[in-house]
């Protein structure tokens, strides 16, 4: 039961995380104009990965896409790439994890296959989350560097007649969305990996042990699945795993060197 819950929760958390990564990637507020002492501005600038926008106090908002690839900073291209890789990996991970969910039965898929798929999706979510966190962090670092550079140059021309006020940019909402979403995807991935360990059949060094109960018998052998079918019609609800790991509907517990590796 705990394994199913962990897997399900991992899936949901990752789903929310990936939705957040997609939202952050599409958002225009990666960097917003620093208002420093002036909370009310006549012209407010903000920028995303794909376009930059200007909102006037009149309410008029104009956005312009970056219609060049070669003219864009390499760092921005890198951030775009990291976010897209994160989304793609996350999307594939979601697709894989749907089929890996213990509560969803697809044909005669064995639990070992589901365990492998859970692990695969978990790793994908972890990498996806890391990509998003890395992308957002690279952009944030770029902002911090530019912020202090523009602060240093802010009052250029103060000695002369004309002053040039440079627009400084600070962290936009998308950065925080990206960090949280990346973190959630990462956590979801870890949960999937933990769930995988509970799903996976465990190898043990025990010799075959036979249990006899009221004329029915089941022989357990290391390295194999059910050896005999003494339980008749009941066996369809029961899979007997090596190493003593048990399914939800098993009543008896069998000796095991360890429950989880």
């Amino acid at each position: 039961m705990a394994v199913t819950a962990c897997q399900g929760l991992g899936f949901v958390v990752s789903l929310i995380g990936i939705a957040g990564i997609i939202a952050a990637t599409c958002m225009d507020q990666w960097s917003t104009q620093d208002l420093y002492n002036n909370p009310v501005t006549a012209v407010f600038n903000y920028q995303g990965l794909w376009r930059s926008c200007v909102r006037e106090s009149s309410g008029f908002t104009e956005c312009r896409g970056y219609f060049t690839l070669l003219g864009l900073p390499a760092m921005l291209q890198a951030v775009r790439a990291l976010m897209i890789v994160g989304i793609v990996l996350g999307a594939i991970g979601l697709l894989v994890s749907i089929f890996a969910l213990k509560c969803i039965r697809i044909g005669s898929m064995e639990d070992s296959a589901k365990a492998n798929m859970t692990l695969t999706s978990g790793i994908m979510f972890i990498v996806s989350g890391l990509c998003a966190i890395a992308g957002v962090s690279v952009f944030a670092n770029m902002l911090v560097t530019n912020f202090w550079m523009s602060t240093a140059n802010m009052y250029t021309g103060m000695g002369g007649m004309v002053q040039t006020v440079q627009t400084r940019y600070t962290f936009g909402a998308a950065l925080f969305v990206g960090w949280v979403a990346g973190g959630l995807t990462l956590i979801g991935g870890v949960m999937m990996c933990i769930a995988c360990r509970g799903l996976a059949p465990e190898e043990t060094n025990y010799k075959a042990v036979s249990y006899h109960a009221s004329g029915h018998s089941v022989a357990y052998k290391p390295g194999g699945f059910k050896a005999s079918t003494g339980f008749g019609s009941n066996t369809k609800n029961k899979k007997i795993y090596d190493g003593g790991a048990r399914t939800e509907d098993e009543v008896q517990s069998y000796p095991s060197k360890h429950d989880y590796v």
């Epitope: 009310v40 006549a42 012209v43 200007v54 106090s57 009149s58 008029f60 002053q163 627009t167």
Partner: antibody
Framework: EVQLVQSGAEVKKPGASVKVSCKAS????????MHWVRQAPGQRLEWMGM????????NYNEKFKGRVTLTLDKSASTAYMELSSLRSEDTAVYYC???????????WGQGTTVTVSS | DIVMTQSPDSLAVSLGERATINCKSS????????????LTWYQQKPGQPPKLLIY???TRESGVPDRFSGSGSGTDFTLTISSLQAEDVAVYYC?????????FGQGTKLEIK
């Protein structure tokens, strides 16, 4: 047709207060910032402050802070500008104006003449 | 605050001739985000409120005759009336629309020679 109709001329004594109204019609009142600009005789136009009819948020010119108060009556689509502690140099024509694209004023009231004299 | 300075203070031009009014700001009015200059031009006739002519330094307001044109960038701007008409006699103001508080030039009085 967009119209901004202001209240009539006022004569006040120094130290008194004046409240000028600006009734808007012909557009959605809550969608545009309302600004107040004054023009003293032979002087340049001087921006006083602004109010958003939807949120009620205001922004004032530091020069007038503490003396000017902008208010609204949404139901009547009317904006008000109150200037207190009047001085002789406050003698001017006071305009309300609607802000549009480009942060420009596309429609203005006809102006309200306020004379401060002892 | 941004200081707006217009030149000349008054100008006399013959009918049909070109009139040019200059405006200089103490800070750049060019917004890097959209490469637009936040400068506005108004026309004011005696006893009337100002009338919007041009915004974004060069965009003509609807209904304004095409003999009015605006140009310039950064801190230096120009309003040009290509062929002066009798009804163009007025005071012209430039306005900083970039930062609060909005500020206006002292005005240029245009007359017929």
């Amino acid at each position: 047709e967009v119209q901004l109709v202001q209240s009539g001329a006022e004569v006040k004594k120094p130290g008194a207060s004046v409240k000028v109204s600006c009734k808007a019609s012909g557009y959605t009142f809550t969608s545009y910032w309302m600004h107040w600009v004054r023009q003293a005789p032979g002087q340049r136009l001087e921006w006083m402050g602004m109010i958003h009819p939807n949120s009620g948020s205001t922004n004032y010119n530091e020069k007038f802070k503490g003396r000017v108060t902008l208010t609204l009556d949404k139901s009547a689509s009317t904006a008000y500008m109150e200037l207190s502690s009047l001085r002789s140099e406050d003698t001017a024509v006071y305009y309300c104006a609607r802000l549009k694209t480009g942060n420009s004023f596309d429609y203005w009231g006809q102006g309200t003449t306020v004379t401060v004299s002892s | 605050d941004i200081v707006m300075t217009q030149s000349p203070d008054s100008l006399a031009v013959s009918l049909g001739e070109r009139a040019t009014i200059n405006c200089k700001s103490s800070q750049s009015l060019l917004n890097s985000g959209n490469q637009k200059n936040y400068l506005t031009w108004y026309q004011q006739k005696p006893g009337q409120p100002p009338k919007l002519l041009i915004y974004w330094a060069s965009t003509r307001e609807s209904g304004v005759p095409d003999r009015f044109s605006g140009s310039g960038s950064g801190t230096d701007f120009t309003l040009t009336i290509s062929s002066l008409q009798a009804e163009d006699v007025a005071v012209y103001y430039c306005q900083n629309a970039y930062t609060y508080p909005f500020t206006f030039g002292q005005g240029t009085k245009l007359e017929i020679k």
